[in-house]
Interface confidence: low
């Protein structure tokens, strides 16, 4: 099983000592959730614990709850047990571990499983600046906005094995938006994105997902053909559609990477052949145009979009008459306003895809820390109940960025001016599917 959201919310809260049973020499079981570990409120979920054929009993523990949380007899052929949650609520959100008992004794605990509930908060808005249609090689910033103050923002990409980024700010500095810059953009960045927001005191409880945003990457000089994004639907489907893959083929990303490279190579050879042919024609016909002029014809491929101005171009006056100076004119304009206040301002749709906020925080670099990935676990971190617990809010919160297996593939920019930013480079090929045995690397940015 591939890691889906592995350690998406790796908060690093050290829990106090807990009473655990004596761990024996038995190998640890595997713990996972179906249909996934990110579940909308009210939906059913099944937690599976798989041990060995010698297992006599399975036990599931939930952190912050009295142990054992549940016990189950093994299902034939005795190597696994099922723990059912018929309807997801806040009470079920949290971190779980399981054990099995054999004639020899109790096993080691499984890697933790983080069960996350969505729908706890109002949905954020995801938008792209300057536009969701971006030329390869240019920059784009994805903005996740919330009008309720939140301190955690998560950006995910459909069909990606790992989250792209998780930003978290210090307590007392809840903000409304996180920026996710991507530069330079390549065809790999194309696809459908969603974001979530959450509060520091309940990180196992996420907002409703934002409406999906499709990032479309068009061609560039290196790739003259319009580069299609993956075939994903932009329609906002049911909230419970899996936000993570459930069975991607390992190394499929690597295969696609090679396909892209081969494609680029073929196109380059074709262009080179065309150039040689034209040069030959030029030499034979004795044209007067210079080689430099001819090469200039190739500088901008057809369909390559001009970069859009950041502010959307020059702002035009709404009325030429506005240039007219004078008290009487303005007074006349004032009197034209409706007095009853019944007219609605309908410039925005209920989904409000417009950029309206910026998240600010000071961020310092800290050394990336390595953690073992728990294959079925989508989110890693300590979540608390929905009650406002001052003690928990007073703890230091980290900004976590879930990166790839290779730390060099994701760069973390020093934040400028108080703007909470994350610079994301091209996602590595391994992002689409990774071996559960391999550790994941997370870059931690501490906010102070």
């Amino acid at each position: 099983m591939i890691p889906t959201f592995t350690a998406l919310l790796c908060l690093g809260l050290s829990l106090g000592p807990r009473t655990h049973m004596q761990a024996g020499p038995l190998p640890k079981p595997t713990l996972w959730a179906e249909p996934g570990s990110v579940i909308s409120w009210g939906n059913s979920v099944t937690i599976w614990c798989q041990g060995t054929l010698e297992a006599r009993e399975y036990r599931l523990d939930k952190e912050e709850s009295p142990a054992p949380w549940d016990r189950q007899n093994p299902l034939e052929p005795k190597n696994k047990a099922r723990f059912s949650i018929p309807s997801m609520t806040e009470d079920y959100a949290g971190r779980y571990r399981c054990y099995y008992r054999s004639p020899v004794g109790w096993s080691q605990p499984s890697d933790p499983l983080e069960l996350v509930m969505t729908g706890a908060y109002s949905k954020p808005t995801l938008s792209a600046l300057p536009s969701p249609l971006v030329t390869s090689g240019k920059s784009v910033t994805l903005l996740c906005q919330s009008r309720s103050p939140m301190d955690t923002f998560l950006l995910i990409k459909e069909r990606a094995a790992h989250p792209l980024l998780h930003l978290r700010s210090e307590h007392g500095a809840q903000q409304h938006q996180a920026e996710f810059p991507m530069s330079p953009v390549t065809s790999v960045h194309g696809g459908t994105y969603r974001c979530f927001s959450s509060h520091g005191f309940s990180h196992y409880l996420l907002s409703h997902p934002s409406d999906p945003l499709e990032l479309i990457v068009s061609g560039s000089l290196e790739d003259p053909r319009p580069s299609p994004t993956r075939s994903v639907s932009t329609a906002a489907g049911p909230e419970d559609q899996p936000l993570m893959p459930t069975g991607s083929v390992p190394h499929s990303g690597l295969r696609r990477h090679w396909e892209v490279l081969i494609g680029v190579l073929v196109v380059s050879i074709l262009l080179l052949s065309l150039l040689l042919f034209l040069l030959l024609q030029h030499w034979r016909q004795g044209k007067h145009r210079t080689l430099a002029q001819r090469q200039a014809d190739f500088q901008r491929p057809p369909g390559a979009a001009e970069p859009e101005p950041k502010d959307g171009g020059l702002q035009r006056r709404s009325s030429p008459a506005a240039d007219v100076q004078g008290e009487n004119f303005c007074a006349a304009v004032k009197n034209t306003q409706p007095e009853d206040g019944v007219e609605m301002d309908t410039r925005q749709s209920p989904h409000d895809e417009d950029p309206q906020a910026v998240t600010y925080a000071k961020v310092k670099h800290s050394r990336p820390r390595r953690e073992m990935a728990s294959p079925p676990s989508p989110l890693s971190g300590e979540f608390l109940d929905t009650k406002d617990r001052q003690a928990e809010e007073d703890r230091q919160m980290d900004t976590e960025a879930a990166a790839s297996e290779a730390p060099q593939d994701v760069t973390y920019a020093q934040l400028h001016s108080f703007t909470l930013r994350q610079k994301a480079t091209e996602p590595p090929p391994s992002q689409e599917g990774a071996s559960p045995a391999e550790p994941s690397v997370y870059a931690t940015l501490a906010i102070h």
């Epitope: 109002s122 809840q174 903000q175």
Partner: antibody
């Protein structure tokens, strides 16, 4: 769109419940606030509710205890006001997190 | 509780001119400040969130700046349609969620 209702003329000391009703949107995913404006005066924030499952509520200090914001259905948020005085006379606006405001409902407290 | 002090209470300027409105918070609210524009008989219109980010459709003539306790809204190249009352609003709360969403007293902008 959103529309407020429930306003009207009441006598001091009475209670009143205002309703914010949504059309074409589900309140279950939005942040809803109540704001009021006395005649010829400025805007005054009363309370907000995150209508997700958390139902987090935030109140202005002066409104705590006397005003209660709640979500009564997927398309309705109410503001219960008790022990009303002449100082509560105002137009009451409902605002959503997608920047949709209702036209407001006028509440007049007079004996 | 957080207080927002808005200055000036009213200002008069000519078409094509510039107006600067200040908003001071009694304690740091980081960048959690919004600006609204309201005309008589209408609900407020959202202009800027998080101190400096413009809402969709808001002309670039409207610029928000500041962080912490000092914030500014600057309207340049004034037009007659800019005549309105402008409000700042805190959109931040601390660990005890006590700051809330207070409004400033408002600034009436008159265009002559």
């Amino acid at each position: 769109s959103v529309k407020e209702s429930g306003g009207g003329l009441v006598t001091p000391g009475e209670s009143l419940k205002l309703t914010c009703k949504a059309s074409g949107m589900d309140f279950s995913k939005y942040w809803i606030c109540w704001v009021r404006q006395a005649p010829g005066k400025g805007l005054e924030w009363i309370a907000c509710i995150d209508t997700g499952r958390s139902a987090i509520t935030v109140y202005a200090k002066w409104a705590k205890g006397r005003f209660t914001i709640s979500k009564t259905s997927s398309t309705t948020v109410t503001l219960q006001m008790t022990t009303l005085t002449a100082a509560d006379t105002a137009t009451y606006f409902c605002e959503t997190s997608v920047d949709l405001w209702g036209p407001g409902t006028l509440v007049t407290i007079s004996s | 509780e957080l207080d927002l002090t808005q200055t000036p209470a009213s200002v008069e300027a000519a078409v094509g001119g510039t107006v600067t409105i200040k908003c001071q918070a009694s304690e740091s609210i980081y960048s959690g400040l919004a600006w609204y524009k309201q005309k008589p008989g209408q609900p407020p219109k959202f202009l800027i969130l998080s101190a400096s980010t413009q809402a969709s459709g808001v002309p670039s003539r409207f610029k928000g700046s500041g962080s912490g306790t000092e914030f500014t809204l600057t309207i340049s190249d004034l037009e007659c349609a800019d005549a309105a009352t402008y409000y700042c609003q805190s959109r931040h709360y601390g660990s005890s969620r006590s700051y809330g969403f207070a409004f400033g007293g408002g600034t009436e902008v008159e265009i002559k």
